[in-house]
Interface confidence: low
């Protein structure tokens, strides 16, 4: 049987998507144009290569990443790659407004598209929270809502506290944490009786969650050292994102095994611990100075992503109606958090360090600029929350949330709905 | 030493293009952004372009958006400005710089950037 | 942009004086501003980066102050070495503004 979409949203959701695209074209057409110039070769390649990479984290490590519900994962890989390729659209034309508007046409590079994956990668994770309890229009509307809400943010910051690409992109964890568990705070949250089974894992899709946290695993150091601006700190991002999502997942199967009665490993703690020493590291990355300490910090971050997953699922199922297995929200809000703390802590010794005597006015700023982050996060997710919620969107009612049929074609499956 | 070495200065007709090269020498080239600056005869430094040390940025002064052009190859270690739609006000010495990171407090990116390495300095005329 | 604003455009020093020359961005910058120095038909030499901090090699005569938008050089003990034209810039977004310059010509 075919799926059957409430048939207002199957009038609604194509045009609304196609119009949006159709508003895209016309807004490259009259904006944008590529840079011109001449690039150095080698160049050239070293920035795609970048560029392939947070591409491949998008698409393959956050696709496969949500796909681990038994009856949900077609829609979680594809509705990723859906929210990925309009948000990287809307991130490019955004972030050239908001910088380089003045002068008439918004010039795209290499490092735009760079930066606007960055920018969808956002979505990605902040949608984990509510993946299978929307519908796509619903979905159009969070990338357009997010995307904005992160650009705006990193612009804000830029002009404010002075900071580079790096480092206000680095708020991203602690953004997209915030904003998908507000988002799924105003969303309905009772799963009716007989539903219960829909938001449990199964084994091969959370096979296909491991393939994606391993696309992830591999390449997060080319995402915290995708925005930097020396060769030097380039490297150092790249050292110490390793070692520390390399101690993480050594932290994240043993300590695993440890919080079991019995000694298990459970499936969905690796899934989101693995990255945990990526997502700790990433705002202070470059400023390491050994691996030793970017190693204590994937130690720290794994066991306290293993402890978060044991112990936060069932809060934040009661109060955000988030299921077990959907604990990329409050995983990255725990470590963006201990991300941006390892920053300030670092930012004193390093202040101590010069003898230029601002410590108080640079902790200062750089609590700021968390807070800002943090608020504009909550704040733009309630007004997504209350946007998913008007009825025009005809959201999946709470009965068939995480269900593939409600969304796809199954020419094999007799159950209709 | 570290030296900056420049290039392909001249006299040119008002509309016609020139290419100025600025080789350099003594440093890791591809570690560093890289400056244009322009002195008219008898007036002050105006700054005309910057490129990031891996190509992937560029800006420029309004006074030349859209005329110049600044690349770079850092296999060659050679910084480049092709200058095309040339006016008679772009009459100068222009200069090709290095720019310098200086760390203040390693964190919180309070790194001052500052031109410390400049080439000797290029003539472009351009007169009918 | 911002536009960078030097005063006065000239001023005259006596040997073993102290001037002070001033620098005013038309926006906050922090503290991303350098000094350069340039003699006549020299290269500009850059002197002072982040507001205060003195590059090597130039004398400790030379000191740099202020934040957001107003800056000063000050010469102490002037030598015929320092009469030149001083130049501040800012580098605190993408571009580079430079001031139109301070010539220090002695008394």
């Known amino acids: 049987m075919s799926s059957k979409y409430p048939r207002s949203v199957r009038r609604c959701l194509p045009l609304w998507a196609l119009t949006l695209e159709a508003a895209l074209i016309l807004l490259f057409y009259f904006f944008t144009h590529y840079d011109a110039s001449l690039e150095d070769q080698k160049g050239l390649v070293a920035s795609y290569q970048v560029g392939q990479d947070l591409t491949v984290m998008a698409a393959i490590g956050l696709g496969f990443l949500t796909s681990s519900f038994r009856r949900h994962s077609w829609s979680s890989v594809a509705f990723n790659l859906f929210m990925l390729a309009l948000g990287v659209q809307w991130a490019i034309l955004l972030d050239g407004f908001l910088s380089q508007f003045p002068s008439g046409k918004v010039v795209i590079t290499l490092f735009s598209i760079r930066l606007a994956t960055m920018s969808a990668l956002s979505v990605l994770i902040s949608v984990d929270a509510v993946l299978g309890k929307v519908n796509l229009a619903q979905l159009v509307v969070m990338v357009l809502v997010e995307v904005t809400a992160l650009g705006n943010l990193r612009m804000v910051i830029s002009n404010i506290f002075n900071t580079d690409y790096h480092m206000n992109m680095m708020h991203i964890y602690v953004f997209a944490a915030y904003f998908g568990l507000s988002v799924a705070w105003c969303l309905p949250k009772p799963l009716p009786e007989g539903t219960e089974d829909k938001d449990q894992t199964a084994t091969i899709p959370s096979l296909s969650a491991m393939l994606g946290a391993l696309f992830l695993w591999m390449f997060w150091p080319s995402f915290n050292s995708a925005l930097l601006r020396s060769p030097i700190e380039r490297k150092n991002a790249v050292f110490n994102t390793y070692y520390a999502v390399a101690v993480s997942v050594v932290t994240a199967i043993s300590g695993s095994s440890l919080a079991h009665p019995q000694g298990k490993i459970s499936k969905t703690y690796v899934h989101s611990a693995v990255l945990a020493g990526g997502v700790a590291v990433g705002t202070s990355c470059h400023l390491i100075p050994s691996p030793w300490l970017a190693m204590v910090l994937g130690l720290v971050a794994g066991l306290i992503s293993v402890g978060g997953a044991k112990y936060l699922p069932g809060c934040c199922n009661r109060v955000l109606g988030i299921p077990h297995s959907s604990i990329m929200g409050y995983n990255f809000s725990l470590l963006g958090l201990l991300g941006e703390i390892i920053y300030i802590v670092l930012l004193v010794l390093d202040t101590v360090g010069a003898g230029n005597g601002m410590i108080g006015f640079q902790v200062l700023l750089s609590i700021g600029e968390l807070s800002l982050a943090i608020v504009i996060a909550l704040m733009s997710g309630l007004l997504t929350g209350l946007l998913l919620n008007l009825k025009i969107w005809k959201a999946p009612h709470e009965a068939k949330y995480f269900d593939d049929q409600v969304f796809w074609k199954f020419p094999h499956l007799a159950v209709g709905f | 030493q570290v030296q900056l070495v420049q290039s392909g200065g001249g006299v040119v007709q008002p509309g016609r293009s020139l290419r100025l090269s600025c080789a350099a020498s003594g440093f890791t080239f591809s570690s560093y952004g890289m400056h244009w600056v322009r002195q008219a005869p008898g007036k002050g430094l105006e700054w005309v372009a910057v490129?990031?040390?891996?190509?992937?940025?560029?800006y420029y002064a309004d006074s030349v958006k859209g005329r110049f052009t600044i690349s770079r190859d850092n296999s060659k270690n050679t910084l480049y400005l092709q200058m095309n739609s040339l006016r008679a006000e772009d009459t100068a010495v222009y200069y090709c710089?290095?720019?310098?990171?200086?760390?203040?407090?390693?964190?919180?990116?309070?790194?001052?950037?500052?031109?410390?390495?400049w080439g000797q300095g290029t003539t472009v005329t351009v007169s009918s | 942009d911002i536009q960078m604003t030097q005063s006065p455009s000239s001023l005259s020093a006596s040997l073993g004086g102290t001037v002070t020359l001033t620098c005013r961005s038309s926006q906050f910058i922090s503290r991303y501003l350098n000094w350069y120095q340039q003699h006549p038909g020299k290269v500009p030499r850059l002197l002072i980066s982040?507001?205060?901090r003195l590059q090597r090699g130039v004398p400790s005569r030379f000191t740099g102050g202020g934040s957001g938008t107003d800056f000063t050089l000050t010469i102490k003990n002037v030598q015929p070495d320092d009469i030149a034209t001083y130049f501040c810039q800012h580098s605190y977004r993408s571009g580079r503004a430079f001031g139109q310059g301070t010539t220090v010509e002695v008394k």
């Open positions: 490129i990031w040390y891996d190509g992937s940025n560029k």
């Open positions: 710089a290095r720019e310098t990171v200086v760390v203040a407090a390693k964190i919180r990116n309070h790194y001052y950037y500052a031109m410390d390495v």
């Open positions: 982040g507001a205060s």
